[in-house]
């Protein structure tokens, strides 16, 4: 797996280098979990024909992926920093179940798909100390989780397979769509 | 990296229009994020509009809004800036750029390929 922003060679060898922003890290951290996304996908498309599905058809689903609606705040028509941001937090917390989910589905991408669970915990933080209006974040309920891990996990094979090419596709669209907002603020 | 080309640009009276595309032979286009710069002689490169991955999420910067509408075909791997009312400072150098990360934004920092430019000019 690759190592985490700032720990990489280039980092270490330019110690002169300014300490990045709170945006700066923010941005690097998504990126790195953008680069994560794309090796775990390379792998599932590598393995199934699930990538040649149409959006449309793959829009067709009973998953309940976080997604960015207008009244959200993320986009243009209507921004709203607070409203935008705490819409983030509250889908990345929502996205950990779906995280943990892929866990277990790689078989030469195991560390990768730690890497970019582990990474998009450290996202949280960082998010979170930039939210001003944190009571307004709702975490999910522990018990309905572990009840939907164990009903995803007991799919057959082939919903595995395209239960995890969802997640990966929607957690990208996520994370680009919040990353977009984010470069805003 | 991908390489980028810009075309459509041309002398256009005021009031008039033009639509500059941005064309790859590129794979894997549709999982760029693309923006549209300008340089108006003597000035820094400013951003004008980028599309995400997903083409619902556009930006436009405050001079341009409500004028000029960013839109992308995949299927034909490029995208359209349609420029409607343009005035005499719409005149400048209009250069596309794409992100591998599918994110964009109005910096040219977030971009890691670019086009040689086209030349739009508004003169009566």
């Known amino acids: 797996a690759p190592v985490p922003p700032g720990e990489d060679s280039k980092d270490v060898a330019a110690p002169h280098r300014q300490p990045l922003t709170s945006s700066e890290r923010i941005d690097k951290q998504i990126r790195y979990i953008l680069d994560g996304i794309s090796a775990l996908r390379k792998e599932t498309c590598n393995k199934s024909n699930m990538c040649e599905s149409s959006k449309e058809a793959l829009a067709e689903n009973n998953l309940n992926l976080p997604k960015m609606a207008e009244k959200d705040g993320c986009f243009q028509s209507g921004f709203n920093e607070e409203t935008c941001l705490v819409k983030i937090i509250t889908g990345l917390l929502e996205f950990e179940v779906y995280l943990e989910y892929l866990q277990n589905r790689f078989e030469s991408s195991e560390e990768q798909a730690r890497a970019v669970q582990m990474s998009t915990k450290v996202l949280i933080q960082f998010l979170q100390k930039k939210a001003k209006n944190l009571d307004a974040i709702t975490t999910p309920d522990p018990t309905t989780n572990a009840s939907l891990l164990t009903k995803l996990q007991a799919q057959n094979q082939w919903l595995q397979d395209m239960t995890t090419h969802l997640i990966l596709r929607s957690f990208k669209e996520f994370l680009q769509s919040s990353l977009r907002a984010l470069r805003q603020m | 990296e991908v390489q980028l080309v810009e075309s459509g640009g041309g002398l256009v009276q005021p009031g008039g229009s033009l639509q500059l595309s941005c064309t790859t032979s590129g794979r894997h286009f549709d999982e760029y994020a693309v923006g549209w710069f300008r340089q108006a002689p003597g000035k820094e490169r400013e951003f004008v509009a980028d599309?995400?991955?997903?083409?619902?999420?556009?930006w436009y910067a405050h001079s341009v809004k409500g004028r000029f509408t960013i839109s992308r075909d995949d299927a034909k791997n490029t995208v359209y800036l349609e420029m409607d009312g343009l005035k005499p400072e719409d005149t400048a150098v209009y250069y596309c750029a794409a992100d591998k990360y599918g994110v964009g934004g109005n910096a040219q920092g977030y971009y890691d390929s670019w086009g040689q430019g086209t030349q739009v000019t508004v003169s009566s």
């Open positions: 599309i995400g991955e997903n083409a619902d999420n556009t």
